[in-house]
Structure formats: structure tokens, C-alpha cells
């Protein structure tokens, strides 16, 4: 009786189980009662990343330099090319099909995580006791100056965008 299901790494064709082609190879001809499945390696700039019965390999992804993309990892016969973005830019999606500028953190916000080729700058609001007076893609929130350690007193309170202003202590006459 012909099989209705096949083992892993096999496929059912013409009422028989044929071996799938291994990653990096494509199907040339199905097996028969007398012959094994015939597979051929993918060509240059092509790949297949699974056990398969594909008759055509997939083209490696093109990292278009006009979009700010460059090759992070060259593709093989079994893996696709991985693109990333040029310095100062990051991917707009996991597939990395285009790039956008890194964001700067506005005054009152500090950098929690510096941007990479695949992720944007992550900003966080400066908590009480900290400030940022610049727009930056790498500066964290800075702590307010401690007037006490300088033998001074606070003359003007700090905010999330400004440092405290220290001044001399009033001397009793």
C-alpha cells in the first residue's frame, strides 16, 4: 500500500517518499522507484536555507548603497545576505530594507541606549536631580552639581534642562 505520510526530510510524490534536498541545494529531479532524488548546489549569489524541494534557489538580498545599506554578513549557499546601515543610520525594520537617521535626545532627555546599525537611540527623561541641556545622540543625563561639597549653597534650583546654580553662603556679621 502506498504511503500517505513520509519521514522527516522526505516528501511524498507519485505515491512514494523522496528525500528532500539539503540546505544549499535545489531539486533537479524527483526520485523514482529506481533512483534517488537529484539535487544541485545553488549558484553564486543564491541560497536555500531549509531542506527543500525547490527547483530554483533564492537570490541573495542586495544591500543597496543608495539606500545607505551595506553588507553585515555575506550570504552563503545556505544563508541569505544580512544588511545593516551605514554609520549614523539604522534600519527601519527587522528586514533592514532602508535606513533612517539616528535620533537625538532633546534637552531634558538623556541617552538610555546609543543607536546601532539596527536600532535607534533610546531616550529617557532626566529624573529629579539630573539634567541635559543639549540635543545629543550619546549624552546621558548629568547629575546636578552638589553645592554642599563645594561649601556653597543653591542659589537657583536645577531643572531637567538646567544645572543648579551655586553661590557663596551668607556670612553672619
Amino acid at each position: 500500500e502506498p504511503p500517505t505520510a513520509c519521514r522527516e526530510k522526505q516528501y511524498l510524490i507519485n505515491s512514494q517518499c523522496c528525500s528532500l534536498c539539503q540546505p544549499g541545494q535545489k531539486l533537479v529531479s524527483d526520485c523514482t522507484e529506481f533512483t534517488e532524488t537529484e539535487c544541485l548546489p545553488c549558484g553564486e549569489s543564491e541560497f536555500l536555507d531549509t531542506w527543500n524541494r525547490e527547483t530554483h534557489c533564492h537570490q541573495h538580498k542586495y544591500c543597496d548603497p543608495n539606500l545607505g545599506l551595506r553588507v553585515q554578513q555575506k550570504g552563503t549557499s545556505e544563508t541569505d545576505t544580512i544588511c545593516t546601515c551605514e554609520e549614523g543610520w539604522h534600519c527601519t525594520s527587522e528586514a533592514c530594507e532602508s535606513c533612517v537617521l539616528h535620533r537625538s535626545c532633546s534637552p531634558g532627555f538623556g541617552v538610555k541606549q546609543i543607536a546601532t546599525g539596527v536600532s535607534d537611540t533610546i531616550c529617557e527623561p532626566c529624573p529629579v536631580g539630573f539634567f541635559s541641556n543639549v540635543s545629543s545622540a550619546f549624552e546621558k543625563c548629568h547629575p546636578w552639581t552638589s553645592c554642599e561639597t563645594k561649601d556653597l549653597v543653591v542659589q537657583q534650583a536645577g531643572t531637567n534642562k538646567t544645572d543648579v546654580v551655586c553661590g557663596p553662603q551668607d556670612r553672619l556679621r
Epitope: 548603497p65 543608495n66 539606500l67 545607505g68 546601515c85 551605514e86 554609520e87 549614523g88 543610520w89 527601519t92 530594507e97 532602508s98 535606513c99 533612517v100 537617521l101 539616528h102 535620533r103 537625538s104 546609543i114 537611540t121 540635543s135 545629543s136 545622540a137 550619546f138 549624552e139
Partner: antibody, heavy 112, light 112 residues
Amino acid sequence: QSVEESGGRLITPGTPLTLTCTVSGFSLSTYAVSWVRQAPGKGLEWIGIIDSGGGTAYASWVKGRFTISKTSTTVDLKITSPTTEDTATYFCARGVTFFGLWGPGTLVTVSS
Amino acid sequence: DIVMTQTPASVEAAVGGTVTIKCQASQSISNYLSWYQQKPGQPPKLLIYRASDLASGVPSRFKGSGSGTEFTLTISDLECADAATYYCQAYYYSGGGSYDYAFGGGTEVVVK
């Protein structure tokens, strides 16, 4: 694929002017576009860039003198308060770290 | 800001000859260097990007080399059509959210 600038004309100092770059054959939701200018007989000078998401970056000398914005098919450059020093041919150019596609340019003359 | 020093300002060579143009960056820009050709009344045309990659449709007579701060454009088997002004352009990201696209002063190539 092409880009073309328009809006250049003779203006008096202090009169705001908006130049438009119209693109065809590609999408501004994928590509970044810069504005570059060239004073008569001089070299090229980068002004600023707008990315596919609408984020902008400007040359350090710009200091609010120019603003770049975009719609789905155009990129605008606003010269906020032109001076005679802003007399130049203004080009829009597509690219991220280099510029592979340029428009023919539009001439802005600032004179009293 | 990055400063690009391009030399020479002008060079003359015979048809079939070779011309070498140099560009020096004030700080390291890795391989973020492009070369453009500009003829009078026309926009710049990209020749080389990433220091040595030839742009689409550009003859292999144009060769770019260098990295870091020193870059060279070599034009061999010079043709009359190569008479133009050539510009280098650097891209630099400071890491502080500041972007810089700086052009060299240009080199006029005269073909005899």
C-alpha cells in the same frame, strides 16, 4: 528615476523662499534626499538631508536659516531669511552617504 | 567640522594621458569618500563611492583609492570628454547626532 528642482527666482534680502524638489520613479518613503548649493563659480556646499521617515539633519553653519520638509512626492527647502550670500544654484540629490542622483538645479538670486 | 583639502586646483594633461587628483580629510572618515564630475551648466555626476566602488555606467578608466584621511582619483587614457571639474565628498557622523557632508574645493581638468 529623476529629481527636479523648482521655485528659484530673483528675491530681495529677507524675503522667505521655498524651493521644491519633485521626485519620480522612486519613493520618498524609502530614499533620503539632500539639498546642496553652489554659488556662481564656486564649489558645492551641503545644506541638509531628510530621511525616508521625515527625520532631518543640517550642516552646522545652517543654524535655522533653512528648513527641509517633505510630502509623498516632493521635498521642500525653505530659506527663512535670505541674504545676498544665499545667491546660488540649489540642487536636490538622492542618497545617504553619497549622492547618486541629482536634479538640474534651480537658481536663486538674492539682490536688493 | 570635516575639512576636505583637494589638490591640485587645476591640472592639464594630453589625450591618452593620466591625471591624479588627491583629497585629504582633516580627520579619519574610513572609506566614506565619493568623487563627482561636473561640467559647466550641469549637475555633478557620481563617479566613485565608498572610496573605490565604481558608480553604475562609469568607465573603468576612473579609479578611486585610499582610506582614513588620504584619497586619490586616477583618470587614465584621458579623453576630451573628461574635461570637467572634479569634486571629492566626505561623509562623517560624529556620534553626537551631528552629520557632516563636506566637499573638496574642486579640481579643474583641462585636456589638451
